[in-house]
């Protein structure tokens, strides 16, 4: 808190310029009018105010706008944004994507901070949904952004926004998140032809049901093992050996290296050993020949 002292003669600021950098904290407080500061915020970003002076400038803006800063001020905060607390940011109403970009730029190259998370939350809530332009912007600055959202939050993502998602944006998503995103991706890419469709949908397949995997197996997609290992176990289990062979194409040989890991391990346990032997990979652990398999879950569903 800066003491209230009178501005020395001749030091009253007429405009926000570089000469203010040499003002002491108390001089800055006494000689810079908060309204002048607010109208000339575009200059503040261009002037390398000292660490202590930024505190004074924030204090002046807080006094002028106790209910929260207007967007005309927010978009020019620059480094001053890094002096804000999440509580400060919760008072803001940010509607312009340009403002959001300007503030994300200040924090670029660093992990998402509580301030940035609050800013994004305010922005998205204000828009009502996570539209394509916003998603484009957020994933450009924070590739992991999408996977930081809850399944409930992801449900507000319109299918059209899925076009903005890059494979690396989904790296840290868990199956619950992919369950929400996959149907949106399927809808978004539905008019693409087979090979193009697979390239786009591949990153989302961790949320695909069995019937979609069966359909893909008929399209010569040659799914790689990394993608296969991320599929839902419950979606993989009902696939036949022939279907998995068609799904993986030349990559089927990779099953041997993964035979102890889910979902491959669990899938092997569900296949007849005879069928597994047709792959010629030496996969072991299938159902021995002559054994009868009862699908109890099917029986329960019928009763």
């Amino acid at each position: 808190e800066v003491e209230k002292t009178a501005c020395p003669s001749g030091k009253k600021a007429r405009e926000i310029d570089e000469s203010l950098i040499f003002y002491k904290k108390w001089e800055l407080e006494a000689c810079v009018d908060a309204a002048l500061l607010a109208t000339q915020m575009d200059r503040v970003n261009a002037i390398p105010f000292t660490y202590e002076q930024l505190d004074v400038l924030k204090h002046k803006l807080d006094e002028l706008y106790p209910q929260g800063y207007p967007e005309s001020v927010i978009q020019h905060l620059g480094y001053l944004f890094l002096k804000m607390s999440p509580e400060d940011i919760r008072k803001w109403n940010v509607t312009s994507l340009e403002t959001l970009k300007a503030l994300l730029e200040v924090n670029k190259g660093h992990e998402m901070s509580p301030q940035v998370a609050t800013l994004i939350d305010r922005f998205v809530k204000g828009r009502g949904q996570l539209d394509k332009d916003t998603l484009d912007t957020l994933t450009a600055f924070y590739p992991g952004y999408l996977c930081s959202l809850s399944p409930e939050e992801l449900s507000s993502v319109p299918p059209s926004s899925i076009w903005a998602v890059r494979p690396q944006d989904l790296d840290t998503c868990d199956p619950r998140q992919l369950d929400v995103l996959y149907p949106k991706a399927r809808l978004a890419f539905q008019n693409m032809n087979g090979s193009e469709y697979f390239v786009k949908i591949q990153s989302f397949l961790g949320g695909a049901p069995t019937e979609d995997l069966k359909a893909l197996s008929q399209q010569n997609v040659s799914m790689d093992l990394a993608t296969f290992m991320k599929l839902r176990t419950d979606a993989v289990l009902p696939l036949t050996v022939a279907e998995v062979q068609k799904l993986l194409g030349p990559h089927v040989e990779g099953l041997k290296a993964e035979e102890r890991h889910r979902p491959v391990r669990d899938w092997i346990l569900r296949q007849r050993q005879d069928d597994l032997d047709t792959l010629g990979l030496g996969l072991q652990g299938g159902i021995p020949n002559g054994y009868l398999v009862l699908d109890l879950s099917m029986q329960e569903a019928l009763s």
Partner: nanobody, 119 residues
Framework: EVQLVESGGGLVQAGGSLRLSCAAS????????MYWYRQAPGKERELVAF???????NVRDSVKGRFTISRDNSKNTLYLQMNSLRAEDTAVYYC?????????????WGQGTLVTVSS
């Protein structure tokens, strides 16, 4: 984290020259503007000069024409060339910068180097 170490201070006669250096280490890629401050005995600390990452500089009126600030980014070093020194320039000179990290700004200071100008 940024570490700042000043050197180059000492005793000099009025009218003489000194060149102060400030070696920066640590997260130097995040450094934008760098500052020289000074604190004379019994007085509050004041800003002497600054230089932005783009190279634009400014010095306070009382040292204009006598002091020059510069930096060598390849050596991560900040300089203050002080000519025509006066008794009133006697002070501890500090180098300072701040960087964004973890969503906030972090302020870093050197330990200071003493400049004594004898008349």
């Amino acid at each position: 984290e940024v570490q700042l170490v000043e050197s180059g201070g000492g005793l000099v006669q009025a009218g003489g020259s000194l060149r102060l250096s400030c070696a920066a280490s640590g997260s130097t890629s995040s450094i934008n503007t760098m500052y020289w401050y000074r604190q004379a005995p019994g007085k509050e600390r004041e800003l002497v000069a600054f230089i932005s990452s783009g190279g634009s500089t400014n010095v306070r009126d009382s040292v204009k024409g006598r002091f020059t600030i510069s930096r060598d980014n390849s050596k991560n070093t900040l300089y203050l060339q002080m000519n025509s020194l006066r008794a009133e320039d006697t002070a501890v000179y500090y180098c300072n910068t701040y960087i964004p990290y973890g969503g906030t700004l972090h302020d870093f200071w050197g330990q200071g180097t003493l400049v004594t100008v004898s008349s």
